[in-house]
């Protein structure tokens, strides 16, 4: 998995008038990292791990950059003609990546009312847009505005690639991101499903990175894919992830089934609690 930094900026307009506030979310390696969600932006680390990345340093630099980006995007939205009545949004997503071989990727994407209409490869400066006429019109609009403001185009947009990578490298230097492996807490529960059957659910939470194997085994052999239901691997708001897997088994055969978990080279098996004990927790180190 490459290391990545992703900026997601959103500005709104109401009846053609651009609103003063904006929302900015920054994800580091796919995790919520920073957020600005007030009229006056103040970069807020998302969880303790985000604070650890820069230690005791203040977030003034991030606040300044995000505020500047928000203003730029509001100006861009103001130049989108033909805005209809009601609420509209302009979103800019900027992503840069550093791969294991040290190669880099950077891109920028614009969305109007949630629909992608313009993308740019920030390394090759190549623009692409969807085929729909609406997207083409919006893309022309925005590109013309960016061309008009040549100074901004030069100093801001073309510098994005370097800036994003510079920030990403700065965050990675802390070592917190690179070193971080948080093992999951695994929790097995059972619930009555129908006569003679029970549903057993295995939940893994608080783990990082997001790659995990979670499955049910009967006497050490994996159950087939279609006999299990999986939840998505989702951020849990603490800089870590959570997911679950469930299956239906015959009551009385609980001891034959185990939840198998594999994460970052470690693995563990977790039995189904028997009888009245509803929750069994185990946290491996």
């Amino acid at each position: 998995e490459p290391h990545s930094l992703r900026y997601n900026l959103t500005v709104l307009s109401w009846d053609g008038s651009v609103q003063s506030g904006f929302l900015t979310e920054v994800h580091l390696d796919g995790q919520p990292f920073l957020r600005c969600d007030r009229q006056k932006c103040r970069a807020k680390p998302q969880g303790q791990w985000a604070e650890d990345v820069l230690g005791n340093k203040t977030w003034d630099r991030e606040t300044r950059d995000l505020t500047g980006n928000g203003k730029d995007l509001r100006m861009t939205l103001a130049h989108i003609k033909d805005q209809k009545e009601g609420l509209h949004s302009l979103q800019e997503i900027r992503v840069c990546e550093i791969h294991e071989d040290n190669s880099t990727r950077s891109s920028q994407h614009f969305y109007y009312d949630g629909e992608l209409f313009l993308s740019q490869n920030l390394e090759t400066k190549e623009w692409t847009m969807p085929q729909s006429s609406r997207a083409q019109t919006l893309a022309m609009n925005v590109r013309n505005f960016l061309k008009e403001d040549a100074m901004k185009t030069k100093t801001h947009y073309h510098a994005m690639h370097a800036d994003c990578l510079q920030e990403l490298r700065r965050y990675l230097k802390s070592g917190v991101v690179l070193r971080r492996t948080v093992p999951p807490m695994v929790n097995v529960t059972r619930s009555e499903a129908s006569e003679g059957n029970i549903t057993v659910t295995c939940r893994a939470s608080g783990f990082y990175p997001w790659n995990i194997t979670l499955s049910w085994r009967q006497d050490g052999v994996s159950l087939s894919h279609d006999t299990q239901q999986w939840g998505d691997v989702l951020p849990d708001g603490n800089g870590t992830y959570q997911t679950w897997v469930a299956t239906r088994i015959c009551q009385g055969e609980e001891q034959r089934f185990t939840c198998y978990m594999e994460h970052s080279g470690n693995h563990s098996t977790h039995p189904v609690p028997s009888g009245k004990v509803l929750v069994l927790q185990s946290h491996w180190q």
Partner: antibody, heavy 121, light 106 residues
Amino acid sequence: EVQLVETGGGLVQPGGSKLSCGASGFTFSSYSMNWVRQAPGKGLEWISYINSRSNTIYYADSVKGRFTISRDNAKNSLYLQMNSLRDEDTAVYYCARVSSITGNTGAFDVWGQGTMVTVSS
Amino acid sequence: DIQLTQSPSSLSASVGHRVTITCRASQSIHNYLNWYQQKPGKAPKLLIYAASSLQSGVPSRFSGSGSGTDFTLTISSLQPEDFATYYCQQSYSTLTFGGGTKVDIK
């Protein structure tokens, strides 16, 4: 006594044949079962697995699409329907039970005596 | 599919000697490995499950070790009844057997 007995072997046509495995001395319906074969002078080759509820079934690539594993818990029986048989399917066929011991890793703790299947064209 | 490679494919040893057979998996299978003994004309017999757990009724001279990709079956002091072929088997990803190791009298 815990026992597995295979039947249905012998000289069979390339068209198809069905093997059976009768279980006794244990609660058959609670156990996952397998078919394993051994060609003359060769090693063991796992060919198919079926769990207790018949909702998880696996096959080795060498028999996928040609062989079908099934079970009848009411009759304490395991079956292997073999179609499109080839010369290389000639082997001793064993049925084997997956152990239920805590901490098991898919080990086969009870085996039948085996039945010889010779494919004759 | 996961391949299991046993070595050596055959070995000659004397009664009372220590014998070691190895089984290597093509990818990590953690401890999902079992060992069997088979004598000519007979069905295989389970010796070791979960890489190192001794099956009930199996003499303590048999032991298993290893995790991940490399596993070992050890017979601490070879007995006349131990001359047989030994197989490893994994259940980490479906099921497969190793090619076998034949142990005969030197």
